[in-house]
């Protein structure tokens, strides 16, 4: 049976809804999106519905939507090309975001190389369930063009979020850029806090506090590096950092016998699955300045 193309497929990028004309006595419906990388995304669709909603998709590379509908009489298959209309090279580029200090996020981008002088960009963010849209509340500008965004309230975000940079110009059509970003990948941790060192005659015990994070993480999700070094060391005598897994009580005990020279300990943190290291904590010092033999640990 020859497939007929009369479904009148249409797509609303704001809601990520693909709709088509309902067919009588539908027995089976499927919808797909295929991108240039060969990735296929297929949402759930029930036979009673004549639409499907996409969630985790990016559109800026140009995509093809496809709908298959079987009825008791015939088969329908229809494709809809969804190109990124506008002049090539006008979209925002080098887009990136990072979450810092738990509650803040900065996103930055560069103007497209073919973008006209009057181009203006606008950032919209939706959580991955597409249930809430945030418009950038505070833009960072370069010669009047928006090239970044600062957010001081991340309450609407989820573990994965959709970022859309639209562009406008009086001269030509501007292409859009969109991206799905995991908060796991973009959060920069603060360094560990409350770093303390206590020593007895043979050992020193370092303790620290797990940094507060935007994501809900357990102690198992943290990896730490400790840099224990002698103060006033010769340049070029670098210590290898000590790797310590997160624990309910973050501590590291190491041999260091008295008398001990003055040392400093600093610590940094990362997500175990990502290893994007935080900056180093303030150094905690131990030992004394008096000149005596140094026990190497």
């Amino acid at each position: 049976e020859k497939p007929a193309s009369s479904l009148n497929v249409r797509f609303d990028a704001r809601t990520m809804n693909l709709t088509w004309d309902c067919q009588e006595n539908t027995t089976f419906s499927r919808c797909f999106l295929t991108d240039k990388k060969g990735r296929v995304v297929e949402p759930r669709v029930t036979n009673k519905e004549c639409s499907c909603t996409f969630r985790e998709i990016c559109l800026h590379g140009g995509v093809t939507f496809e709908v298959h509908v079987n009825t008791s009489q015939r088969t329908f298959q229809e494709k809809l090309l969804y190109p990124n209309s506008g002049r090539e090279g006008t979209a925002a580029q080098n887009f990136s975001c990072f979450i810092y200090n738990v509650d803040f996020m900065n996103c930055t981008w560069a103007r497209g190389p073919k973008a006209p002088r009057d181009v203006q960009y606008f950032l919209y963010i939706q959580n991955s369930k597409r249930r809430r849209e945030i418009q950038c509340p505070y833009y960072i500008e370069d010669s009047g063009t928006h090239v970044g965004c600062h957010l001081g309230n991340l309450s609407g975000l989820t573990s994965r979020n959709y970022f859309l940079v639209n562009g406008t110009s009086q001269e030509i059509g501007i292409q859009f850029f969109d991206s799905l970003l995991d908060t796991k990948k973009i959060e920069r941790f603060n360094p560990p806090g409350n770093v303390t060192v206590r020593c007895n005659t043979t050992h020193c015990l370092v303790r620290w506090k797990q940094p507060r994070t935007y994501q809900k993480l357990s102690y198992l999700d943290f990896q730490y590096q400790l840099d224990v070094h002698r103060k006033n060391m010769q340049p070029g005598t670098e210590n290898l950092p000590i790797n310590v897994s997160g624990d309910l009580e973050n501590r590291y005990n190491f041999p260091s016998s008295e008398p001990r020279a003055k040392h400093a300990v600093k610590i940094r943190a990362a997500d175990v699955r990502i290893l994007n290291w935080s900056s180093w904590s303030e150094a905690a010092e131990f030992g004394s300045d008096e000149r005596h033999h140094h026990h190497h640990h």
Partner: antibody, heavy 123, light 107 residues
């Protein structure tokens, strides 16, 4: 502790279909993304796709389009992989897998695996 | 897609020896790399994620290192139960891809 338990081995003829199940315990299905990885005899591991049981979205490679369907039954916490129009090259061990941090397109490491289901396609 | 290439294909060593397995990505995957162990008739088991962090319950004789395109799994002192096939897998780019495996066998 989370466990994934898969259905038993299947022998199918070319052109037929097969449906492999993956029962989750220790978590509810809607909290997870379930991925399917296959391993042909004596070969390496190949990611097939991922499925979000909460909203039903599936993510897979174009070469599987039209032959692969991933579904889930949230009432029984069971995920399913259905393969249609089977060919001899579909003979493989099929694993369901998930992790502590997953979406439909990847996991930050597959922490948990089913024991595997051997599907043999032979005339 | 990112191609992961493991070497050597087979490594023959004796218990007590040190094993070094390599994995190279066709483009940078940052630290988004996992290592798995698979024994005959069993499912793969996650050993390492984030290129160097050991998964829960993995003995400390297993260690991972590297970032970008070159990664190493080291087993400091081989135990009889360590002889298996080892796979690396990147999760930086879609689709997630595995290496072809390194078989670690008893000499």
């Amino acid at each position: 502790q989370m466990q994934l338990v898969q259905s038993g081995a299947e022998v199918k003829k070319p052109g037929a279909s097969v449906k492999v199940s993956c029962k989750v315990s220790g978590h509810t299905l809607t909290e997870l993304s379930i991925h399917w990885v296959r391993q042909a005899p004596g070969k390496g591991l190949e990611w097939m796709g991922g499925f979000d049981p909460e909203d039903g979205e599936t993510n897979y490679a174009q070469k599987s389009q039209g032959r692969v369907t991933m579904t889930g039954d949230t009432s029984t916490d069971t995920a399913y992989l259905e393969l249609s129009s089977l060919r001899s090259e579909d003979t493989a061990l099929y694993y369901c897998a998930t992790g502590r941090y997953c979406s439909t397109d990847t996991c930050y490491g597959f922490d948990y695996w089913g024991q595997g289901t051997l599907v043999t396609v032979s005339s | 897609e990112i191609v992961m290439t493991q070497s050597p294909a087979t490594l023959s060593l004796s218990p007590g020896e040190r094993a070094t397995l390599s994995c190279r990505a066709s483009q940078s995957v940052s630290s988004y790399l996992a290592w798995y162990q698979q024994k005959p008739g069993q499912a793969p088991r996650l050993l390492i994620y984030g290129a160097s962090s050991r998964a829960t319950g993995i003995p400390d004789r297993f260690s991972g290192s590297g970032s970008g395109t070159d990664f190493t799994l080291t087993i400091s002192r081989l135990e009889p139960e360590d002889f298996a096939v080892y796979y690396c897998q990147q999760y930086n780019n879609w689709p997630p891809t595995f290496g072809q495996g390194t078989k670690l066998e008893i000499k």
